[in-house]
């Protein structure tokens, strides 16, 4: 807490400019009017205030806006966002995607902080759903964002937003999340032709049911082993040897290296030895 002291003569700030960089903490507190700061927030980020000085600027804004900052101020916070607590952010109403982007930029490259998580939560709840532009923005800053959501939260993602998802965005998703995302992806990509469809749907297949895998096996997709290993065990078990062979194409030879791992191990145990022998891989059921 900064002590209240009188502003020295001639030091009262007429505008927010670089002369303030040389003010001590107490001088900033005494000589900068909170209303002036709020109206000239667009200048703050261009001025290289020290990390220490940001505390005073935040204190000023808190006094002026005890119920939470207006978006006109929030959009210009820049590095001041680093000083905000989740409690501060819960008072905000952020509606503009540009404001969201500006604040995420400050934390760019770092893992998600509680402040950022709160900001995103407020923003998405305010919008009512995770639209494509928002998802595009969030996964650009945080590739693992989608997989940090619960299946319930994912259910509000409209199929149109799935176009924004890149394979790496799904790297940390678990089967329950893919169960929710897969039907949305299937719907989103339904008008694509066979090979293009497979490229797009591939990273969502951990949520695919048996009948869809059977259908894919008729389309010469040549699924790689990494994708196959991420399929739901219960979806793989009913597939015949012939269907798996068609599904994997030239990659079928990779089954040998994975014969001790799920879902390959469980699938092998379900097959007749005669059928497995047709693969010529020496798999033992």
């Amino acid at each position: 807490e900064v002590e209240k002291t009188a502003c020295p003569s001639g030091k009262k700030a007429r505008e927010i400019d670089e002369s303030l960089i040389f003010y001590k903490k107490w001088e900033l507190e005494a000589c900068v009017d909170a209303a002036l700061l709020a109206t000239q927030m667009d200048r703050v980020n261009a001025i290289p205030f020290t990390y220490e000085q940001l505390d005073v600027l935040k204190h000023k804004l808190d006094e002026l806006y005890p119920q939470g900052y207006p978006e006109s101020v929030i959009q210009h916070l820049g590095y001041l966002f680093l000083k905000m607590s989740p409690e501060d952010i819960r008072k905000w109403n952020v509606t503009s995607l540009e404001t969201l982007k500006a604040l995420l930029e400050v934390n760019k490259g770092h893992e998600m902080s509680p402040q950022v998580a709160t900001l995103i939560d407020r923003f998405v709840k305010g919008r009512g759903q995770l639209d494509k532009d928002t998802l595009d923005t969030l996964t650009a800053f945080y590739p693992g964002y989608l997989c940090s959501l619960s299946p319930e939260e994912l259910s509000s993602v409209p199929p149109s937003s799935i176009w924004a998802v890149r394979p790496q965005d799904l790297d940390t998703c678990d089967p329950r999340q893919l169960d929710v995302l897969y039907p949305k992806a299937r719907l989103a990509f339904q008008n694509m032709n066979g090979s293009e469809y497979f490229v797009k749907i591939q990273s969502f297949l951990g949520g695919a049911p048996t009948e869809d895998l059977k259908a894919l096996s008729q389309q010469n997709v040549s699924m790689d082993l990494a994708t196959f290993m991420k399929l739901r065990t219960d979806a793989v078990l009913p597939l015949t040897v012939a269907e798996v062979q068609k599904l994997l194409g030239p990659h079928v030879e990779g089954l040998k290296a994975e014969e001790r791992h799920r879902p390959v191990r469980d699938w092998i145990l379900r097959q007749r030895q005669d059928d497995l022998d047709t693969l010529g891989l020496g798999l033992q059921g």
């Epitope: 670089e18 261009a46 290289p48 990390y51 220490e52 590095y79 490259g109 902080s113």
Partner: antibody, heavy 116, light 107 residues
């Protein structure tokens, strides 16, 4: 992809001058702060100077104040360190780095040797 | 100027060990501290810039903690690629200052 590439290092006699360049790509320097940090052989990191190209605001370590000048040409997306009155103790690898507070990207460094 | 004092200045450890490096500021710097890793002949790499948040690509075995004057970088299970020198940096007040470094060597 963000990249910083230093150049201009070399051998110089005490009292001599050198101008180091830091060419940035993958971002525009006027939206960032650019720093020069040096490392004497076998020693730790020492901050030397900083510039905020958007405003031209500069800062210097006491050890180089009055001898070194940091500048930036935003049209070339390049920062510079003009080093005058060089001393033996200025011998170091000089790195340029980017970032308002922490430094998230660094160049590969350029060696400056001050010796007679 | 704010002095940053790291300890130890060097340590020997084995792969799999838990390693802790501390950094003490000569005055309160709140949470304005970053951590870097530097390997011989290479530029430093940012590990942690904001509070205790890892920078992208930094393995989760690294973690940072502390505020005020005492800060810690921990490697939960040392890997061969972690043998390097580690630096803390305060950016709370000008001039920004670095610790003298902690060299982590193979035992």
């Amino acid at each position: 992809e963000v990249q910083l590439v230093e150049s201009g290092g070399g051998l110089v006699q005490p009292g001599g001058s050198l101008r180091l360049s830091c060419a940035a790509s993958g971002f525009t320097i006027d939206k960032e702060a650019i720093h020069w940090v040096r490392q004497a052989p076998g020693k730790g990191l020492e901050w030397v100077a900083s510039i905020y190209p958007h405003s031209g605001f500069t800062l210097y370590a006491d050890s180089v104040k009055g001898r070194f000048t940091i500048s930036a040409d935003t049209s070339k997306n390049t920062a510079y360190l003009q080093m005058n009155s060089l001393r033996a103790e200025d011998t170091a690898v000089y790195y340029c780095a980017r970032g308002r507070y922490w430094m998230d990207y660094w160049g590969q460094g350029t060696l400056v040797t001050v010796s007679s | 100027d704010i002095q940053m004092t790291q300890s130890p200045s060097s340590l020997s450890a084995s792969v799999g060990d838990r390693v802790t490096i501390t950094c003490r500021a000569s005055q309160d710097v709140e949470d304005g501290v970053a951590w870097y890793q530097q390997k011989p002949g290479k530029a430093p790499k940012l590990l942690i810039g904001i509070k205790d948040l890892l920078y992208s690509g930094v393995p989760s075995r690294f973690s940072g903690s502390g505020s005020g004057t005492d800060f810690t970088l921990t490697i939960s299970s040392l890997q061969p690629e972690d043998f390097a020198t580690y630096y803390c940096q305060q950016y709370y007040r000008w001039p920004s200052t670095f610790g003298q470094g902690t060299k982590v060597e193979i035992k």
